[in-house]
């Protein structure tokens, strides 16, 4: 996590729609060869729901060995259980795989809560569901964990998709997406669809149900609707972004842009909720209360602790205000905001013993790491990962959860100044000053 | 103040029954979510049964359901938990909870500790083999 001193804010102006729709650098543009259609082969890919993770089969080793592997793009470790754990139906074995070498160093990575620690080696890799490829890549093969694995979650590993940057344990290991697009002719881009389903799934349903679509090196048209929208990635590390204004049911929260992107914004699969800044959750949390106000909530569901429930199909959505996040344009002070709907951050929970109440947890929380847009609001939208071009796109998905009155949107363009200001610089730490 | 006061718990053979009372007191009971609770040693306290009030809607826990049955009866200010078919495993302190309605639509979820504002002091039941 980065810790850095508060800088004096600078608010950025806000978004006032442009009568005139300025360029799109999306259908517009001629593509690379092979970057946009239909990867039909890798269509519905994906398995598993916001609260325990995506995941994507892959095969490890020689001969192959098949794994359930979490699609994270906010770390950049391809890590995998190797040892029994009681949460793991299957794990792999290195002793088994004729291709297995050993790198002769460790790797620990503790979070918040939990850790898992392994040893470093490399392997043959593919994607069953995926370009047909196999890639050597980086395996971390995780030999001890605490709080990592997921009881009934159905994954035995992790798959990070983000830059070498934050690699453990350095950013000299090279993380499995590099060596895919440096090994392999796939274009170094991919896209992710999160379906959530809108409704609890015991194990069961999850296993026989969809989960969304990871298409690896390109861009699928059935998978979303109306344009795709792209904001830069900031910094190549997390996939990090800028946000320059939030809005509740249109209202603006008014906030110093710079405090949305505190310390950082980053899209991340593999965390559940939407993830805001202390001082703007309290600001969100304050007008989607008075926006639902019809309705007294106990401060426990707002803090995520305690559900709340309504008989069956009764759920009323329309009380529920809709949060847009306006996101830094592609070209100079202009902007387009994605909003979601309650249908996206109420998360459906299955309570206990009963089928006959649709139980929900507020999905979103507070962060003192900054922005974390989770699974929470890729469930809404089709997300392509470009990182040939260094950008983030967000289209409408083609299966997110809304009603027949409201629908997630991403719309623009809108006129906003001044929005470099909004990212927040974190504090480099000087090396030498430590020496003393 | 509101006051919960159960009964009715006792000693049992497995296959027979007891049914547990529960008086409310101290406050207007119509409308009210009730519940019952139990606690094994050294376990934690789990939501067995569960009434709305007003609406007579119930719910139970999978490991009763069909053996056990809430029900309320409005001019006793009293709940009831009917327990047939008793099993060893259902030894414990039964514990009767209330709360007020939260004046919504929505309702908290009924089987959870959470949800409920106010407790009896508990009544055991022993289930012998």
């Known amino acids: 996590t980065q810790h850095g001193i508060r800088l004096p804010l600078r608010s950025g102006l806000g978004g006032a729609p442009l009568g005139l729709r300025l360029p799109r650098e999306t259908d517009e543009e001629p593509e690379e060869p092979g970057r946009r259609g239909s990867f039909v082969e890798m269509v519905d890919n994906l398995r598993g729901k916001s609260g325990q993770g995506y995941y994507v089969e892959m095969t490890v080793g020689s001969p192959p060995q098949t794994l359930n592997i979490l699609v994270d793009t906010g770390s950049s470790n391809f890590a995998v259980g190797a040892a029994p754990h009681p949460f793991l139906h299957r794990y792999y074995q290195r002793q088994l795989s004729s291709t297995y070498r050993d790198l002769r160093k460790g790797v620990y990575v503790p979070y918040t809560q939990g850790k898992w620690e392994g040893e470093l080696g490399t392997d043959l890799v593919s994607i069953p569901h995926g370009p047909n490829v196999t890639v050597r890549a980086n395996i971390a093969a995780i030999t001890e964990s605490d709080k990592f694995f997921i009881n009934g979650s159905n994954w035995e590993g992790i798959l990070g998709l983000a830059y070498a940057e934050i690699a453990r344990p350095d950013d000299s290991l090279e993380p499995f997406f590099d060596s895919l697009v440096k090994q392999t002719h796939v274009p170094n881009l991919f896209s992710l669809q999160l379906c959530g389903a809108g409704f609890p799934l015991n194990q069961s349903e999850v296993l026989a149900s969809v989960g969304g679509s990871m298409i690896i090196g390109g861009i699928d048209h059935s998978l979303y609707t109306g344009s795709l929208w792209y904001t830069p990635i900031r910094r190549e590390w997390y996939y990090e972004v800028i946000i320059v204004r939030v809005e509740i049911n249109g209202q603006d929260l008014k906030m110093d842009c710079k405090e949305y992107n505190y310390d950082k914004s980053i899209v991340d699969s593999g965390t559940t909720n939407l993830r805001l800044p202390k001082k703007v959750f309290e600001a969100a949390v304050k007008s989607i209360k008075a926006a639902s106000s019809t309705e007294k909530f106990p401060d426990g569901f707002w803090l995520g602790e305690q559900l709340v429930c309504w008989q069956a199909g009764t759920t009323p959505w329309n009380i529920f205000p809709v949060i847009s996040l306006y996101l830094m344009g592609e070209v100079t002070n202009q902007s387009f905001r994605i909003t979601i709907l309650p249908q996206q951050y109420l998360r459906p929970v299955e309570d206990v013993a009963t089928s006959q109440d649709d139980c929900y947890k507020f999905a979103i929380s507070q962060s003192s790491t900054g922005t974390v847009m989770g699974a929470v609001i890729m469930e809404g939208f089709y997300v392509v990962f470009d990182r040939a071009r260094k950008r983030i796109g967000f289209a409408v998905s083609a299966c997110h959860v809304h009603d027949e009155f409201r629908t997630a949107a991403v719309e623009g363009p809108f006129v906003t100044l001044d929005m470099e200001d909004c990212g927040y610089n974190i504090p480099q730490t000087d090396e030498s000053t430590l020496m003393t | 103040d509101v006051q919960l006061q159960e009964s009715g718990g006792g000693s049992a053979q497995a296959g027979g029954s007891l049914r547990l009372s529960c008086e409310v007191s101290?406050?207007?009971?119509?409308?009210?979510?009730m519940g019952w609770f139990r606690q094994a040693p050294g376990e934690e306290r789990e939501g067995v049964a569960a009434?709305?009030?007003?609406?007579?809607?119930?719910w139970y826990a999978d490991s009763v359901k069909g053996r056990f049955t809430i029900s309320h009866d409005n001019a006793e200010s009293t709940v009831y938990l009917q327990m047939n078919s008793l099993q060893p495993e259902d030894t414990a302190i039964y514990f009767c909870a209330a709360r007020r309605p939260p004046g919504g639509s929505w309702y908290p979820p009924p089987l959870r500790k959470y949800s409920y504002n106010f407790w009896g002091q508990g009544t055991q039941v022993t289930v012998s083999s």
């Open positions: 101290g406050y207007t009971y119509s409308g009210y979510f």
């Open positions: 009434i709305d009030t007003n609406g007579g809607r119930t």
